[in-house]
């Protein structure tokens, strides 16, 4: 039952992200930023199951990429970062297996390229912000909160996926 497995993985990832905080976020209030989280892309009502999975996959892939950089390694406690990356990697594998399974069941799987592009642009804005802020501790703290927000939002998409099972 992939949606169930993924939901548990998502919860574990959220807990790890929560534990990764290194500085008080209240010292970073002035650094907060609107990254334009594409909330409509996490509304499962508008997608086929394969489309929803591909949006989740893109979000997790981009998160994995973001936290796999050298700058990220310098920003976070190593063991937590490794656990977080491992959790994301496992989720990506699960989702890929699920896509293969679903494609075999659906007549004509539609690609939702606009949604995937929206997620990519969202992460580009996050990367640009980090670059502009010179990967400061506060910049990373703001990004950590933002990623937690996007993961929470993706939970809604997973709930809808589960209802479609």
């Amino acid at each position: 039952d992939l949606p169930q497995t993924h939901s548990l993985g998502n919860r574990r990832a959220l807990i790890l992200l929560a534990q990764m905080g290194r500085i008080s976020p209240f010292s970073c209030l002035k650094d907060r930023h609107d990254f334009g989280l594409p909330q409509e892309e996490f509304d499962g009502n508008q997608f086929q199951k394969t489309q929803a999975i591909s949006v989740l996959h893109e979000m997790i892939q981009q998160t994995f990429n973001l936290f796999s950089t050298e700058d990220s390694s310098a920003a976070w406690e190593q063991s937590l970062l490794e656990k977080f990356s491992t959790e994301l990697y496992q989720q990506l594998n699960n989702l890929e297996a699920c896509v293969i399974q679903e494609v075999g069941m659906e007549e004509t799987p539609l690609m939702n390229e606009d949604s995937i592009l929206a997620v990519r642009k969202y992460f580009q804005r996050i990367t640009l912000y980090l670059t502009e802020k010179k990967y400061s501790p506060c910049a990373w703290e703001v990004v950590r909160a933002e990623i937690m927000r996007s993961f929470s939002l993706s939970t809604n998409l997973q709930k809808r996926l589960r209802r479609k099972d």
Epitope: A18, H33, D34, G36, V142, R149
Partner: antibody, heavy 120, light 111 residues
């Protein structure tokens, strides 16, 4: 479902200290900041401070820095607030409230409130 | 500290009409695309309930007759059409900087 259960009414003498509790259930207690808010009878709301139960990190409204002390015991899923050197001005209802939407710092779930009455 | 001034202190609105509540901050609470102003409803003997976050985002489960607008220092909560159950005190709260503060409240009475 998320619930915040606060301790009951407290009657205290001026100069004394009181410690109230807020037991959380229905969510991961260690991963959400917990705010404390004061409301005097017939008056508005005042933000006292916030604690992160996961590591005990606290941030206070300077006005309450020497008045309130926030703590949490993760094994009991309970947050505490101790008020010291009580005066009549401390007579109020005190709410614990869960932080919401990460760094937007809004408050979604609220305890039912602990009423503190300071009287000689 | 940022002072939030709510007006009016109280208002009476007929059933089905529009209620407009204003909240003015002594300093901007907006930064990089977000306005850190939120609205709560508190009914007598109850705890506050979040209605609107980030100036204009409706909290899940809150009726669409509630709406928020504004940026910088001037914010508005609108309720239209007003219903009997909307009788309550409404508070704005900012999270733009420390300490977070609340407005003094606006008591809404339904005529």
């Amino acid at each position: 479902q998320v619930q915040l259960q606060e301790s009951g009414t407290v009657l205290a003498r001026p100069g004394a200290s009181v410690k109230m509790s807020c037991k959380a259930s229905g969510y991961s207690f260690t991963t959400y900041w917990m705010h404390w808010v004061k409301q005097r009878p017939g008056q508005g709301l005042e933000w006292i401070g916030v604690i992160y139960p996961g590591n005990g990190d606290t941030t206070y409204n300077q006005k309450f820095k020497d008045k309130a002390k926030l703590t949490a015991v993760t094994s009991a899923n309970t947050a505490y607030m101790e008020l010291s050197s009580l005066t009549n001005e401390d007579s109020a209802v005190y709410f614990c409230t869960r932080n919401y939407k990460y760094d937007y710092y809004t408050m979604d779930y609220w305890g039912q409130g602990t009423t503190v009455t300071v009287s000689s | 500290d940022i002072v939030l001034t709510q007006s009016p202190a109280s208002l009476a609105v007929s059933l089905g009409q529009r209620a407009t509540i204003s909240c003015r901050a002594s300093k901007s609470v907006s930064t990089s695309g977000h306005s850190y102003m939120h609205w709560y409803q508190q009914k007598p003997g109850q705890t506050p309930k979040l209605l609107i976050y980030l100036a204009s985002n409706l909290e899940s489960g809150v009726p669409a007759r509630f709406s928020g607008s504004g940026s910088g220092t001037d914010f508005t909560l609108n309720i239209h059409p007003v219903e009997e159950e909307d009788a309550a005190t409404y508070y704005c709260q900012h999270s733009g900087e420390l300490p977070f503060t609340f407005g003094s409240g606006t008591k809404l009475e339904i005529k």
